[in-house]
Interface confidence: low
């Protein structure tokens, strides 16, 4: 495939990445799959500057990001190291709360209304943000 030189239509370019902001809600798994179908991934926040950019675009709305601990440790969907990376959790979060009565704990991270992060039940249908890097090769469809 060839290297992307500009963002797809309806995507926003910022610091060599392209971002797409949903206006509907999906469960985390569906949002994750949506981004993958777009040859992208749920947003991975690597700096305070990127946090502010995303926060500005989503407003005070619960919004999924590409961070989860469904297999144990917290992981970013693109493999970015969680332990050494940027974090912006709300106080006392993540708490893997079981008291919601919905079964299980809380395994997926989202931006809250103030932009800080919370872990929540992955089935909640929140908005989401997809991200893809301009410097990565795009997937050309195979010739049939």
């Amino acid at each position: 495939g060839s290297e992307r030189t500009c963002c797809p239509v309806n995507w926003v370019e910022h610091e060599r990445s392209c971002y797409w902001f949903s206006r509907s809600g999906k469960a985390w798994a569906d949002a994750d799959n949506y981004c993958r179908l777009e040859d992208a991934h749920l947003v991975v926040v690597t700096s305070w500057e990127e946090q502010k950019f995303v926060q500005h675009h989503i407003g005070p709305v619960n919004t999924w990001m590409g961070l989860h601990d469904q297999n144990g440790p917290w992981k970013w969907v693109d493999g970015t190291d969680y332990e050494t990376g940027f974090k912006n959790w709300r106080p006392e979060q993540p708490d893997d709360w079981y008291g919601h009565g919905l079964g299980g704990g809380e395994d997926c991270a989202h931006f809250t209304d103030d932009g800080r992060w919370n872990d929540d039940v992955c089935q909640r249908p929140y908005r989401w943000v997809c991200e893809t890097e301009l410097d990565k090769a795009s997937q050309e469809p195979p010739l049939l």
């Epitope: 469904q70 008291g99 009565g101 919905l102 909640r124 929140y126």
Partner: antibody
Framework: QVQLVESGGGLVKPGGSLRLSCAAS????????MSWIRQAPGKGLEWLSY????????FYADSVKGRFTISRDNAKNSLYLQMNSLRAEDTAVYYC?????????WGQGTLVTVSS | DIVMTQSPDSLAVSLGERATINCKSS????????????LAWYQQKPGQPPNLLIY???TRESGVPDRFSGSGSGTDFTLTISSMQAEDVAVYYC?????????FGPGTKVDIR
């Protein structure tokens, strides 16, 4: 024990409106997502709409989008479905259901008949 | 939308015999990150609302007799009644809750032969 009781069904003319209610008890209503599901006479189940625990997120099936509105009042432990521009094909038993890994509790349903 | 299909449309089973119902989804309902299939099975008896039997494709809801079991992964699923009882006469539905809108199969009617 968990109980869901629907009300508000009845006979309505095409183009008319109805508001269904679902009274919940026996669980912490504000912790749960809720759905409306319907079943036309002699037919299968059709999932219609879904509302988050706080009421901030809603979703509709295409068949009712723009005509039906789901809402909730957590202080009253109640779920609602406002149905406008009703059509003959909306005739069905309407169920409210507590939503999680599937719908684990259902009401007994309320019958809506749309006919002139 | 994910389309759910079921087979057969109906079946008649002798008391004590095994009943098998198949459900197929138009796309996978398996989420690889947690290895769970977002599929449920319901039983609906005449004049009653549906009753949740199985969730996560194979986990029995509390209070459901162990003669009911669910299996399968991805797009192909099965509900099995290991020993048919008179009270099992009902219509059985599968439902995916992986992708909004959640969708049901058309149902399989199970009777006593």
């Amino acid at each position: 024990q968990v109980q869901l009781v629907e009300s508000g069904g009845g006979l309505v003319k095409p183009g008319g409106s109805l508001r269904l209610s679902c009274a919940a008890s026996g669980f912490t209503f504000s912790d749960y997502y809720m759905s409306w599901i319907r079943q036309a006479p002699g037919k299968g189940l059709e999932w219609l709409s879904y509302i988050s625990s706080s009421g901030t997120t809603v979703f509709y099936a295409d068949s009712v989008k723009g005509r039906f509105t789901i809402s909730r009042d957590n202080a009253k432990n109640s779920l609602y479905l406002q149905m406008n521009s009703l059509r003959a094909e909306d005739t069905a038993v309407y169920y409210c259901a507590r939503e999680w890994v599937g719908a684990d509790y259902w009401g007994q349903g309320t019958l809506v008949t749309v006919s002139s | 939308d994910i389309v759910m299909t079921q087979s057969p449309d109906s079946l008649a089973v002798s008391l004590g015999e095994r009943a098998t119902i198949n459900c197929k989804s138009s796309q996978s309902v398996l989420f690889n990150s947690n290895n769970k299939n977002y599929l449920a099975w319901y039983q609906q008896k005449p004049g009653q609302p549906p009753n949740l039997l199985i969730y996560w494709a194979s986990t029995r809801e509390s209070g459901v007799p162990d003669r009911f079991s669910g299996s399968g992964s991805g797009t192909d699923f099965t509900l099995t009644i290991s020993s048919m009882q008179a009270e099992d006469v009902a219509v059985y539905y599968c439902q995916q809750y992986c992708s909004l809108p959640f969708t049901f199969g058309p149902g399989t009617k199970v009777d006593i032969r």
